[in-house]
């Protein structure tokens, strides 16, 4: 008997969907495996006799639920298949936004970049995909545990009246109000504000 | 929400002509992929031609030749031009769509898209 593939799952970020799985202790020699999904109630092969233990998924609908399954292989015996369900826009991972942060003065001005569609030529980002995108900016003091959360109506935002000669750190991630679903937080950009630009009386 | 609805169907004698449209309303028309399907009666749904937003399209190798697909951005309409019809051509052909996408792939599999309109008949006689 052949083993079946083994912690079968799908790493699915911003629509790039790979399936994955382990090979499977087998003494007789390598293993290869197939991967299939189900289309209008015939499985089609994605992956054939492949000695890699991944197979990318990206084509398929973002919007239909998908059964997929794999299984392994050696000269003319097989596994039984191991399946997996996945709807790619429910299950799919935000990944973090771009974020371009600029030091004017007393103020840090941000501008939020959605990610990209991961597995599409073209521009079209993860907030065309999702009607509710919106974005969670969470900001604080350099050294403090204390931290404020905002949420920008528009693709940039300004914090103003910042204590002057401070260094800020600030990250962002999307959010989809309708699905109580957050994505990855970016990678924080610290920067330092210069001085309060109130002219004294 | 997207919605699509196939027109054009009907009936024809072999080595005819057809032009099936497909309406779509929805999201940004530019966006989609789109394709055409058909299925006749006890066999499963195949892939006949698509276009990507990008304008590549891809066709069955059974239409190839017989067949072209083209959309109009500005009317949010899918074309297809079936001439040279053929007894086997005879099916339920259904319009397909699935939005923000591009070229990439073939985009001839029903498990591509996500809508679907509710079909129309072709019927080619000997």
């Known amino acids: 008997m052949v083993p079946p593939p083994e912690n079968v799952r799908m790493n699915s970020v911003n629509f790039k969907n790979i399936l994955q799985w382990e090979s499977p202790a087998f003494a007789k020699g390598n293993l290869t495996f197939t991967a299939q999904y189900l289309s209008y109630r015939i499985f089609q092969d994605k992956c054939m006799n492949t000695t890699l233990t991944e197979c990318d998924f990206s084509s398929l609908s973002k919007y239909g639920d998908h059964t997929l399954r794999v299984r392994a292989e050696f000269a003319d015996e097989h596994s039984d298949w191991v399946n997996i369900t996945f709807c790619p826009v429910d299950d799919t991972i935000i990944g973090p936004p771009g974020m371009q942060v600029e030091v004017l003065a007393d103020s840090l001005h941000m501008r939020f970049l959605a990610p990209k569609i991961e597995n599409e030529y073209e521009t079209w980002t993860m907030k065309n995909v999702y009607n509710s995108w919106t974005y969670n900016v969470q900001y604080w003091k350099n050294g403090t545990d204390e931290k404020f959360q905002i949420t920008p109506q528009y693709d940039f935002e300004v914090l103003r009246n910042l204590e002057p000669w401070t260094t800020y750190c600030v990250q962002v991630r999307g959010f989809l109000p309708d699905r109580n679903k957050a994505g990855e937080w970016s990678e924080p950009v610290c920067e330092q504000t210069t001085h309060d630009e109130t002219v004294p009386s | 929400q997207v919605q699509l609805q196939e027109s054009g169907g009907g009936s024809v004698q072999a080595g005819g002509s057809l032009r099936l449209s497909c309406a779509a309303s929805g999201y940004s028309y530019s966006s989609y992929c789109m394709g055409w399907f058909r299925q006749a009666p006890g066999k499963e749904r195949e892939g006949v031609a698509a276009i990507a937003s990008d304008g590549s399209t891809s066709y069955a190798d059974s239409v190839k030749g017989r067949f072209a697909i083209s959309k109009d951005n500005a009317k949010n309409t899918l074309y297809l031009q079936m001439a040279s019809l053929k007894p086997e051509d005879t099916a339920m052909y259904y319009c397909?769509?699935?939005?923000?996408?591009?070229?990439?792939?073939?985009?001839?599999?029903?498990?591509?898209?996500?809508?679907w309109g509710q079909g129309t008949q072709v019927t080619v006689s000997s």
């Open positions: 397909a769509a699935e939005p923000w996408c591009t070229g990439g792939y073939s985009r001839l599999t029903p498990a591509e898209y996500g809508y």
